[in-house]
């Protein structure tokens, strides 16, 4: 065909409002004189003696010019049909990247402006290198590589196996039949890391302790199951109808609240962050509710079988908290991380 096919569906040619457009008759050889008509309209738009051969020139197109055009050779044989669609070249897409763990990150994008045309995105990334490697050939380990687009979520690609300490450059190029436009974004995993909120938050009363609540939770499922880098947590709680949250930073995966308001239900929520403060705090987990126990502590049952109970008096000094689950960082990785 003498008409180079722009990216997009066959038989469609593209233009920009307010600009000239040159349409091309697809079924004839280059330079063959043709007549042009609007589909369904017998009025001649451009005759075979125009000197433009198989091309139709429209000086300044606008929305009424969109539609189907028919070209015919001198002997009246149809040279084919062309549909003109108007739109705009791509603007730079807006790109942002997020990470919910320290090994992978995802980038999402949206068009800088709506082009009104069929659009696709080319996504790739490479590891940025330190300056000064003049004498060395660039290592293949720096890429570039494609950033695989998520088949289930449009406008998202995921980089797997990223290095926590490296910096990456993301390239998102928006392509449509009128052109291409590229956005670049430099990304450090340690800067964009924002864990998912902790999961499985439970709030339980502590029998016999009317001012205590025990909250426990687990790591978010998206965090690696045998983590080199740990999470730290922030816990907030408040009695029902109380506007202000109290905040504590627990040492592990549970916390005993010792100043709960007796008899009132309490809302509790937790947030997570990398244990060495990379990135930012997660969003808060969904609130869980719990009410301190109102009962008393059963004492030792005497030999004669009579049950003695004694009302609880909250001790001045709290009894030791239950042992924390051990999740200590791997010392070599800690050393490595401290040394950077």
């Amino acid at each position: 065909s003498p008409c180079p096919q722009a990216w997009g569906p066959p038989g469609v040619q593209y233009g920009q409002p307010g600009r000239p457009v040159m349409l091309c008759c697809p079924g004839v050889s280059a330079g063959t004189p043709v007549s042009w008509f609007r589909d369904g309209d017998s009025r001649l738009l451009q005759g075979p003696d125009s000197g433009l051969g198989h091309r139709l020139v429209l000086a300044q197109v606008d929305s009424p010019d969109e539609g189907t055009y028919v070209c015919q050779t001198l002997d009246g044989v149809s040279g084919g049909m062309v549909t003109l669609k108007l739109g705009f070249p791509p603007a730079r897409p807006e790109v942002s990247c997020q990470a919910v763990d320290y090994e992978n990150f995802s980038c999402t994008w949206s068009p800088g402006q709506v082009s009104g045309l069929p659009t696709r995105y080319l996504t790739s990334y490479r590891k940025k290198t330190l300056p000064g490697a003049e004498s060395q050939r660039e290592s293949p380990s720096t890429g570039p590589w494609p950033c695989p687009q998520d088949p289930l979520e449009a406008s998202r690609c995921v980089v797997h196996g990223a290095e926590f300490w490296s910096e990456y450059r993301i390239n998102v190029t928006e392509v449509n039949p009128l052109g291409a436009s590229t956005s670049l974004l430099d990304v450090r995993l340690q800067s964009i890391l924002r864990p998912d909120p902790p999961q499985g938050l439970r709030v339980e009363s502590v029998p016999g302790y009317p001012r205590r609540l025990r909250a426990s939770w687990t790591y978010p499922a998206s965090w690696p199951s045998q983590p080199h880098f740990l999470l730290k947590f922030r816990l907030q709680y408040r009695p029902a109808q109380h506007p202000a949250w109290s905040t504590v930073e627990p040492a592990g995966l549970e916390e005993v609240i010792t100043d709960a308001v007796a008899g009132l239900p309490h809302a509790v929520r937790v947030s997570a962050r990398d244990f060495l403060d990379a990135g930012t705090w997660s969003t808060w987990s969904p609130e869980a509710w719990g009410t301190p126990s109102t009962g008393t502590i059963p004492k030792e049952i005497p030999a004669w079988g009579q049950l003695h109970t004694q009302p609880e008096v909250e001790p001045q000094v709290d009894s030791p908290a239950p042992p924390r689950p051990s999740l200590q960082p791997h010392p070599r990785l800690l050393d490595h991380r401290d040394s950077v």
């Epitope: 807006e94 790109v95 940025k128 003049e134 050939r137 390239n171 590229t182 974004l185 430099d186």
Partner: antibody, heavy 126, light 112 residues
Framework: EVQLLESGGGLVQPGGSLRLSCAAS????????MGWVRQAPGKGLEWVSY????????GYADSVKGRFTISRDNSKNTLYLQMHSLRAEDTAVYYC???????????????????WGQGTMVTVSS | QSALTQPPSASGSPGQSVAISCTGT?????????VSWYQQHPGKAPKLLIY???KRPSGVPDRFSGSKAGNTASLTVSGLQAEDEADYYC???????????FGTGTKVTVLG
């Protein structure tokens, strides 16, 4: 080896034109910002022009704006500087240089030229 | 785009330190952390010594260090050696027209 090789310099009359080329090798050219820097005989370095990896954005020193055009062909790993309306004060060694740049969500910034070519001499004289 | 201001010359004996200043404005040096320093020997292309104010490329000795305060950046060469005799240029992102700006250059002489 990471390398930049300039060509196209020479003697040209005032008002004339010249096109400089810079062939890049040993790195993924299409991912880097590139620039031209010049140095008049016995003088200091002067920033001339700068281009984004895709070629979509460019920048120029005030002294060359409207007369010089920077461009690149990523398929050929080549950077160009088209110079028109040349003046005697454009006489200099022209260096091509590479920059990794820094790109935030809002803008990209010139960072530092880490790789330089050997330079090509442009002499504007009648 | 006015050139950044550097002293025309600086000197020191081998083993001594020499500091070179680079003064700009809030639109260049003061406004961004994209200040770099280059060394140029006669007849050769410039070589990157410092980027992003304080960072050293691989292969550059730690005798070279950079800093910045306000609108003025500085390069310090400690433990001067004969091969440090060269011209030194600072550069900064210029904040306009996607352009940058170089300093006026400083010739460093190693005495003796």
């Amino acid at each position: 080896e990471v390398q930049l090789l300039e060509s196209g310099g020479g003697l040209v009359q005032p008002g004339g034109s010249l096109r400089l080329s810079c062939a890049a090798s040993g790195f993924t050219f299409s991912w880097y910002f590139m620039g031209w820097v010049r140095q008049a005989p016995g003088k200091g370095l002067e920033w001339v022009s700068y281009i984004y990896p895709s070629g979509g954005s460019t920048g120029y020193a005030d002294s060359v704006k409207g007369r010089f055009t920077i461009s690149r062909d990523n398929s050929k790993n080549t950077l160009y500087l088209q110079m028109h309306s040349l003046r005697a004060e454009d006489t200099a060694v022209y260096y091509c240089a590479r920059d990794e740049g820094y790109c935030s969500s809002t803008s990209c910034y010139f960072d530092a030229f880490d790789i330089w070519g050997q330079g090509t001499m442009v002499t504007v004289s009648s | 785009q006015s050139a950044l201001t550097q002293p025309p010359s600086a000197s020191g004996s081998p083993g001594q330190s020499v500091a070179i200043s680079c003064t700009g404005t809030s639109s260049d040096v003061g406004g961004y952390n994209f200040v770099s320093w280059y060394q140029q020997h006669p007849g050769k292309a410039p070589k990157l010594l410092i980027y992003e104010v304080t960072k050293r490329p691989s292969g550059v000795p730690d005798r070279f260090s950079g800093s910045k305060a306000g609108n003025t950046a500085s390069l310090t060469v400690s433990g001067l050696q004969a091969e440090d005799e060269a011209d030194y240029y600072c550069s900064s992102y210029g904040g306009s027209n996607n352009a940058g700006v170089f300093g006026t250059g400083t010739k460093v002489t190693v005495l003796g």
